[in-house]
């Protein structure tokens, strides 16, 4: 169990002087309004900070913004507002940072009402210089970079025009009118929904999904009667209005819309929704909302085609009103996901899956913890972790659960121990094995971040009072030491560290409590002298992931293989370093029936691992449709779980069945698909896709 804060952990000696020498204060010489921070590039140390200040006047709001740049991870900042001609920047568009290490930045300016178009400031040298460009349109959305080529930009106008630039925003061309939603696909493809009647908001379900592969020279309508569309991994999804026009069904394409399959998922009515919770090139987690304002639905996991789905979790919490779900991919361990269910008694309970949604179980409570008042049995309860739903309902939860791919097995989360999520003040819990076991690491709510690939965890208490203390741990949250980073406490607003958890620097943002004017201030602390030496081979130990029974030959097998990692010893206080690469040794497992999904037309009876044929397909909600026509489907009843690498062992062979089912979707068939050249009728409107804080791939 965790010794707690400042008990004799014996981890880091003389740390106060070391940290004091590496603590850098910067007071921003402007009034406290709002602040946004962006990292430009990876491992460049370049940070851009935009402060904006709105003065509420009776008739209008007067605003001013300042732009600051750091090239040493936030230790020093230079006011570069003059590079953007002291222009007021629109914060709702943020700073559009180019992909990878392109060094590109686009800032969208606030312009006066009568102007012909908007204005942007562009930089392609990591914000050392900016070029002002007047736009021939008023942007509705932030500029979208092509993932393949950062010179190619996409934007929607307030008039619902789709505009493309091929020279990093220097020149713009309107390639289509009446566009509701646009997204970059693979290889420079652009997908968008358009309504030739002109309205986006009123005619959802009557949109056309179009594609251009040549930046607007030609178009192909790949689907009609579209409600919405989304991209996830290799999959293109469209929710399509069915025959009666009141129900929608999901269609999936893996070839950019050339051909479509109808997903074997229940159709939904107008008050329901679909949401892709997670997707990669192998599979999809899809949430299907229950009818009525239930606040929950069912999670389905797909096969590798994205068409056949297995029921993964029922009563999955996903609010209809705010669109909150607690679904989280634990990135520090393969196959691990957590989320919440809405129990019959309306309590919210946390569950975890260690096998990519195959099975969901409660989280094991820390060994030494007592069950709280929500527990019926004071000895038997589980850990419940707070995520988006708790934050949305106003609980004292400052952060979502946190994990990083390069900090293997490490998970930090707010939680409580009982029968359900508690409304009481939460504590911070840490797992070092991907969610199998947990310790209570910190009392009360905190902000937290991971540095040096898990070598250091930094936390700051969540308080309404000004603060001046940070806590840090060099042993994955077991022991904590405190450091007073300033004599004068500040109102804390955020903790910033370079994305990717490889940095040794942490920036504490806040504003001063002042007799004069409250100002933005940042304190950047470099932990390089705490972890004085580079880690060596002796500092690492072998760890088998997903190990629950060392006696079992199959111990650690998840999705057909097990992985051994080299993990930093908790007692080692050393630097993993910026170039640290996770060392893992995979080994293939023998196949069992658990490595297979039931194919279309088959299901698993409860407590049985065998797939049996559905006795009667007719009348089921689930439809299966290949290419929009009646098809023969041949199946042996089993299909390997996407990403499963097992070999040998059980190889389920069943006689081949011929399943015949008429497709009832009025989805546009490929033979009806038509190409057309640029240009279409005018109109306006807007359609917003919802993207969740925890990167929900698509919510229709």
């Amino acid at each position: 169990s965790a010794p707690g804060e400042d008990e004799e952990c014996g981890r880091v000696r003389d740390f106060v002087a070391k940290l004091a020498n590496n603590t850098h204060q910067h007071v921003f010489d402007d009034l406290r309004g709002s602040v946004s921070l962006s990292w430009v590039g990876d491992s460049t140390g370049v940070i851009l900070v935009l402060t904006t200040f709105h003065v509420p006047l009776v008739i209008m709001t007067f605003g001013q913004s300042k732009l600051y740049r750091s090239e040493d991870y936030g230790k020093n900042f230079k006011d570069i507002t003059d590079l953007i001609n002291n222009t007021f920047i629109r914060t709702e568009f943020g700073m559009a940072i180019g992909p990878e290490n392109s060094g590109k930045v686009v800032l969208t300016a606030e312009v006066s009402g009568g102007s012909r178009g908007g204005r942007i400031f562009r930089s392609s040298d990591f914000a050392k210089n900016f070029v002002q460009t007047d736009l021939p349109f008023h942007p509705l959305t932030q500029m979208m970079y092509s993932p393949q080529n950062s010179d190619y930009l996409l934007a929607l106008s307030t008039e619902n025009g789709l505009w493309v630039s091929k020279n990093f925003g220097g020149k713009w061309e309107e390639i289509h009118k009446t566009v509701c939603l646009a997204k970059w696909g693979r290889k420079g493809t652009i997908f968008f929904t358009a309504n030739h009647n002109g309205s986006c908001s009123n005619d959802r379900g009557m949109l056309e999904l179009e594609r251009t592969t040549d930046y607007g020279k030609s178009f192909k309508t790949v689907a009609s009667k579209i409600y919405s569309f989304g991209l996830g991994g290799k999959f293109l999804f469209a929710s399509v209005m069915t025959g009666k026009g009141t129900l929608r069904a999901i269609h999936v394409s893996v070839d950019d819309g050339d051909t479509w399959n109808m997903a074997q998922l229940p159709p939904v009515g107008h008050e329901q929704f679909y949401s892709i919770l997670a997707a990669n090139d192998e599979m999809v987690f899809m949430h299907v909302d229950e009818p009525g304002d239930s606040g929950f639905g069912t999670i389905y996991v797909s096969d590798d085609r994205g068409t056949v789905y297995s029921k993964s979790l029922e009563r999955h919490l996903y609010t209809t009103t705010g669109g909150e779900t607690d679904f989280i991919n634990v990135t520090s361990l393969r196959g691990v996901f957590t989320t919440s269910i809405l129990a019959e008694d309306k309590s919210v309970q946390s569950v975890i899956s260690f096998d990519q949604g195959g099975e969901w179980v409660p989280l094991r409570k820390p060994a030494d913890s007592k069950c709280d008042a929500t527990a019926r049995d004071p000895e038997k309860c589980s850990l419940h972790i707070h995520a988006a739903y708790s934050i949305a309902t106003g609980l004292n939860v400052p952060m979502l659960p946190l994990s990083e791919p390069n900090a293997v097995g490490l998970v930090l989360a707010h939680g409580s121990v009982g029968d359900a999520i508690s409304v009481m003040r939460p504590d911070v819990y840490v797992s070092d094995d991907g969610g199998y076991t947990w310790i209570k690491a910190l009392e009360g709510p905190h902000y937290y971040t991971i540095l040096d690939s898990g070598g250091i965890i930094v936390a700051i208490e969540h308080s309404s009072r000004p603060i001046n203390v940070i806590k840090f741990s060099t042993d994955e949250g077991q022991c904590w030491q405190t450091y007073t980073f300033t004599r004068d406490p500040i109102y804390f607003t955020g903790l910033a560290s370079e994305p990717g958890a490889r940095s040794m620097n942490i920036s504490i943002w806040g504003f001063t409590e002042s007799f004069l004017t409250s100002q933005w201030v940042s304190y950047t602390i470099d932990f390089k002298d705490i972890l004085e030496r580079n880690c060596e081979e002796k500092d690492y130990t072998i760890w088998l992931a997903h190990s629950t029974d060392p006696e079992d030959y199959e111990d650690g097998c998840i999705l057909g293989y097990k992985e051994q990692f080299l993990r930093l010893r908790k007692s080692s206080v050393c630097q993993n370093g910026r170039d640290y690469v996770v060392t893992k040794q995979p080994s293939i497992c023998l196949c069992s029936l658990e490595d297979f999904l039931c194919d279309f037309g088959y299901y698993r009876p409860e407590n049985d691992s065998k797939c049996v044929e559905q006795p009667e397909l007719k009348g089921h909600d689930l439809e299966f449709c290949l290419y929009g026509r009646e098809e023969h489907l041949t199946t042996n009843g089993y299909r390997k779980i996407p990403g499963d690498k097992c070999q040998g062992g059980v190889n389920p062979v069943r006689e081949v069945k011929d399943l015949k089912k008429k497709c009832t979707s009025n989805f546009l068939s490929p033979e009806k698909q038509n190409s057309k050249s640029n240009g279409s009728a005018g109109g306006s409107g807007g359609l917003n896709d919802i993207f969740e804080a925890q990167k929900i791939e698509w919510h229709e």
Partner: antibody, heavy 117, light 112 residues
Framework: EVHLVESGGDLVNPGGSLKLSCEAS????????MSWVRQTPDKRLEWVAM????????QYPDSVKGRFTISRDNAKNTLYLQMSGLKSEDTGTYHC??????????WGQGTLVTVSA | DVVMTQTPLTLSVTIGQPASISCKSS???????????LNWLLQRPGQSPKRLIY???KLDSGVPDRFTGSGSGTDFTLRISRVEAEDLGVYYC?????????FGAGTKLELK
């Protein structure tokens, strides 16, 4: 435009209490430190109390320490001065002032406090 | 407490002519942060005081550039290059470097 409007001034007996209010508008109240300054009948200006932007810190001159309490409600954009144990030398016009990079950047029109038997 | 001494107490001027007011503090007003918290205020007849100059020499917005502030340490001066009718009233200096904050007794600028 910055607007500060004081209220609550009155005629009060020595030893009595009074609470002054100052309603602020035209700026983001929670960002700025605030003060009360009084002007005595002989036109001298005297700083009376000061409060920091978030209301955490306060300062007073010895002449009012222990008798006056400055406070603020940032949600209501209002500054207060609670006065007790009032003396005749506390008589004057009490002005609410807003600070910026220095002190007393903006002044309200004032509210008259008279301490007399 | 820091005593602020203003001279003269009354200054009779002619419209269009220059004017100068002195303010001396009993201690240096240079703060540890490098700033000098010395303000000049003007109170026109029947009005509240209004700040003209802060941090020795910085003009508040809307203040005409005929006003200039100068000085350092303990000696400070407010100059008006050409007095106009709207400049008449009582001028106060005040310091904000040391607690308690203190004001000068005021200088009345009046017409000759």
């Amino acid at each position: 435009e910055v607007h500060l409007v004081e209220s609550g001034g009155d005629l009060v007996n020595p030893g009595g209490s009074l609470k002054l209010s100052c309603e602020a508008s035209g700026f983001i109240f929670s960002i700025y430190g605030m003060s009360w300054v009084r002007q005595t009948p002989d036109k001298r200006l005297e700083w009376v109390a000061m409060i920091s932007s978030g209301g955490i810190y306060t300062q007073y001159p010895d002449s009012v320490k222990g008798r006056f309490t400055i406070s603020r409600d940032n949600a209501k954009n209002t500054l207060y001065l609670q006065m007790s144990g009032l003396k005749s030398e506390d008589t004057g016009t009490y002005h609410c002032t807003r600070h910026d990079d220095s002190w007393f950047a903006y002044w309200g029109q004032g509210t008259l406090v008279t301490v007399s038997a | 407490d820091v005593v602020m001494t203003q001279t003269p107490l009354t200054l009779s001027v002619t419209i269009g002519q220059p004017a100068s007011i002195s303010c001396k503090s009993s201690q240096s007003l240079l703060d540890s942060n490098g700033k000098t918290y010395l303000n000049w205020l003007l109170q026109r007849p029947g009005q509240s005081p209004k700040r003209l100059i802060y941090l020795v020499s910085k003009l508040d917005s809307g203040v005409p550039d005929r006003f200039t502030g100068s000085g350092s340490g303990t000696d400070f001066t407010l100059r008006i290059s050409r007095v106009e009718a709207e400049d008449l009233g009582v001028y106060y200096c005040c310091q904000g470097t040391h607690f308690p904050l203190t004001f000068g007794a005021g200088t009345k600028l009046e017409l000759k």
